[in-house]
């Protein structure tokens, strides 16, 4: 004999107090399957939590985080403190990022400049604890001869095709 | 919108048997149960039975056990209440109410009046 | 079966003032789920009942805010904090938590 438990549609508990009766899910709980003996309860968006979709009878709410913080973990599980750019946090809250390093994020932590030299590279441009270096040509393309600005190719006339 | 509409009043004789219709619109039938309650005049509300419309089972209050069946149309959206053996205690409004919320009876019929008369 | 008891029978109100129906079940209305399961309805002159309150407290869509309802283990209150002409009619307490589900005898609420 089947279980009608197990027909019970989703936004309804089979509830055994009352007689297997596919009753609705009480209010703040969800059941996002058929069959289910129990609804689930809703998550609560509290705090620096804030709902980015209400709970239904069929699914669970979801957050996301208030202005100044931002979601870690799968579902949003839990909401981190945003820092600056060239920033990173620590138990301590927010500090700048050390000489040598740099974020250019509100999250994450400060990473090491990129050592152009290990790519036998030069720098153009020095790192900032917002921005990396910016490497530039090696110093055998600086040679004399060597020219390093590429010359524009010619127009063509409009109208024409290429031959 | 959300309704129950039930069939229209009906006069039977004692020993003879009754069924009442009752019509769900505006809503997915087979979501919600449906319980049937009664009212003879100057009573209280009596519970009698419900159905799991998108299941099709049942259960009856005890003392209409042997006389009751609530039976189901899901192609239709409507549920049936018959009850046999009738006597005349069983002149009364007959209700169906549509289980919307956990425990709670949300939409009504209109209600069908049954009179059991010789 | 659990019974139900309602008190008063009849219950005449001067619009504007408050009112208070009592309900007292014969046995706990608790479900596994935390909730109680006791229901009020009103039954207006020639209508159908309409549902107010479900699982004790918690007001039905549609419903004034000024129905509310409380519960103290077996004994439940349904108050209204003014009442307004369109309340007559007859309140049952319901409790649909074991069968049969059965109502009170109903509490007749009438304007002086």
């Known amino acids: 004999l089947q279980d009608p438990c197990s027909n019970c549609p989703a936004g309804t508990f089979c509830d055994n107090n009352r007689n297997q009766i596919c009753s609705p899910c009480p209010p703040n709980s969800f059941s996002s399957a058929g069959g289910q003996r129990t609804c689930d309860i809703c998550r609560q968006c509290k705090g620096v939590f804030r709902t980015r979709k209400e709970c239904s009878s069929t699914s669970n709410a979801e957050c996301d985080c208030t202005p100044g913080f931002h979601c870690l973990g799968a579902g949003c599980s839990m909401c981190e403190q945003d820092c600056k750019q060239g920033q990173e946090l620590t138990k301590k809250g927010c500090k700048d990022c050390c000489f040598g390093t740099f974020n250019d994020q509100k999250r994450g932590i400060c990473r090491p400049w990129t050592n152009c030299s290990l790519d036998g590279k030069s720098v153009l441009v020095n790192g900032t604890k917002e921005r990396d270096v910016v490497c530039g040509p090696s110093p055998a393309d600086l040679s004399p001869g060597a020219s390093s600005v590429t010359p524009p190719a010619p127009a063509r006339e409009p109208g024409h095709s290429p031959q | 919108q959300v309704q129950l509409v039930q069939s229209g009043a009906e006069v039977k004789k004692p020993g003879a048997s009754v069924k009442v219709s009752c019509k769900a619109s505006?809503?997915?039938?087979?979501?919600?149960?449906m319980h049937w309650v009664r009212q003879a005049p100057g009573q209280r509300l009596e519970w009698m039975g419900w159905s799991n419309a998108g299941i099709g089972n049942t259960k009856y209050s005890q003392e209409f056990q042997d006389r009751i069946t609530i039976s189901r149309d899901t192609s239709a959206s409507t549920v049936y209440m018959e009850l046999s053996s009738l006597r005349s205690e069983d002149m009364a409004v007959y209700y169906c109410?549509?289980?919307?919320?956990?425990?709670?009876?949300?939409?009504w019929g209109q209600g069908t009046m049954v009179t059991v008369s010789s | 079966d659990i019974v139900m008891t309602q008190s008063p029978l009849s219950l005449p109100v001067t619009p504007g003032e408050p009112a208070s129906i009592s309900c007292r079940s014969s046995q706990s209305l608790l479900h596994s789920n935390g909730y109680n399961y006791l229901n009020w309805y009103l039954q207006k002159p020639g209508q159908s009942p309409q549902l107010l309150i479900y699982?004790?407290?918690i007001r039905a869509s549609g419903v004034p805010d000024r129905f509310s309802g409380s519960e103290s283990g077996t004994d439940f209150t349904l108050k209204i904090s003014r009442v307004e002409a369109e309340d007559v009619g007859v309140y049952y307490c319901?409790?649909?938590?074991?069968?049969?589900?059965?109502f009170g005898q109903g509490t007749k609420l009438e304007i002086k």
């Open positions: 505006g809503y997915t039938f087979t979501t919600y149960p």
């Open positions: 699982l004790g407290s």
């Open positions: 109410a549509r289980e919307g919320v956990a425990g709670g009876f949300d939409i």
């Open positions: 319901m409790q649909p938590l074991q069968i049969p589900y059965t």
